[in-house]
């Protein structure tokens, strides 16, 4: 009998507001034996996929997923879904991505350190379970 | 079809260097992490050291044996993964396999180069 | 780091049985552990992976068990090509420790 896969979680690091030209990781998390982490953008058509996972608790692993200088035109919705054999899970909530001129001045506002969830999450569609994995045939139009 | 294929081995002096490679195919190299394992004759089995994908840095980790001798490095562009091995000792001789980590397991295992130590 | 207790060192069974395997984790480390079989002259080939998991083509008499710092594997009704060696490894934290093995003979 097949299990019932949990739902990822998203989250960025540092934050969810991340100054033009900086970094983000974005890190997904979902049980042991995940085979692949996807990190979708927008909609499912443009994704990246990894194998590197690792531990994050005994019962849980993660993958990262980094952008190393950020663009606006990388700002949007973000979500992790997983493949953990024979099946996808479901996909994530959504993790908004904000992309601000780097004044860094003192008025500028923080970024939200390790932020998953507030105003910026928003509730996947929860259309789930009919993705295919990357090497079946379905495109990855990478996201950065 | 997965293939790892090790070559470098071979035989060596006592605080000799070698470099081992592994030319990877098969599957999307640059989002798997790789892995250096060995095994001694008649012995069982040892990792050795793993490196991460580019997204993690290309962060490395290594044996308490071999910290501060091995050093792994790899080639996204050509799909290499290497194994610069330093001031080597006897007790190095082994059997040396590049193995593929997906999702936290070690799936998949080339089938080994030897090196031996000797003087 | 994390040690690995495996047991038994070796192990004698008869065609057709039914024979179990522990691993002993130092600490807890979930179900972050696999099981190996090889072949004299051949390389590792993972079996178990996550503690309870089947690997991709390898036949279900193979099980695995266990979380925690706890584990069994088992393998049923033993077949000629089962005689070999085993081996558990965590992959909980580097270094990626593995049990000493296990070799698994006829009887």
């Known amino acids: 009998q097949e299990e019932d896969l949990p739902r990822p979680s998203i989250s960025a690091e540092p934050g969810t507001v991340i100054p033009l030209g900086s970094h983000v990781t974005f890190v997904c998390r979902g049980p042991v034996g995940v085979q692949t982490f996807r990190l979708e953008r927008d909609s499912r058509s443009t994704y990246n996929d990894t194998e590197d996972v690792s531990q994050a608790s005994p019962s849980e692993s993660e993958a990262r997923f980094r952008i190393d200088s950020v663009r606006e035109g990388n700002a949007g919705l973000y979500r992790c879904i997983y493949y953990k054999p024979p099946k996808w899970s479901e996909q994530s909530d959504y993790l908004e991505l904000l992309v601000k001129e780097s004044s860094g001045g003192p008025d500028s506002p923080d970024t939200e350190p390790g932020s998953s969830a507030g105003p910026t999450q928003r509730p996947s569609d929860n259309s789930h379970n009919e993705h295919a994995p990357a090497s079946q045939g379905l495109k990855a139009e990478h996201l950065y | 079809e997965v293939q790892l294929v090790e070559s470098g081995g071979g035989l060596v002096q006592p605080k000799g260097s070698l470099k081992l490679s592994c030319a990877a195919s098969?599957?999307?190299?640059?989002?798997?992490?790789m892995n250096w394992v060995r095994q001694a004759p008649g012995k069982g089995l040892e990792w050795v050291a793993r490196i991460r994908t580019k997204s993690n840095n290309y962060a490395t980790y290594y044996a308490d044996s071999v910290k501060d001798r091995f050093i792994i490095s790899r080639d996204d562009s050509e799909n290499m993964v290497y194994l610069q091995m330093n001031n080597l000792k006897t007790e190095d001789t082994a059997i040396y396999y590049c193995v593929r980590l997906r999702g936290g397991f070690l799936d998949y295992w080339g089938q080994g180069t030897t090196l031996t130590v000797s003087s | 780091d994390i040690q690995m207790t495996q047991s038994p060192a070796s192990q004698s069974a008869s065609l057709g049985e039914s024979v179990t395997i522990t691993c002993l984790a130092s600490?807890?480390?979930?179900?972050?552990l696999a099981w190996y079989q090889q072949k004299p002259g051949r390389s590792p080939q993972l079996l178990i992976y996550a503690a309870t998991s089947l690997a991709d083509g390898v036949p279900s008499r193979f099980s695995g068990s266990g979380s925690g710092t706890k584990f069994s594997f088992k393998i049923n009704s033993l077949q000629a090509e089962d005689f070999v060696s085993y081996y558990c490894q965590q992959l909980y934290s580097t270094p990626f420790t593995f049990g000493s093995g296990t070799k698994l003979e006829i009887k």
């Open positions: 098969g599957f999307s190299f640059n989002t798997h992490a």
């Open positions: 600490q807890t480390i979930g179900t972050w």
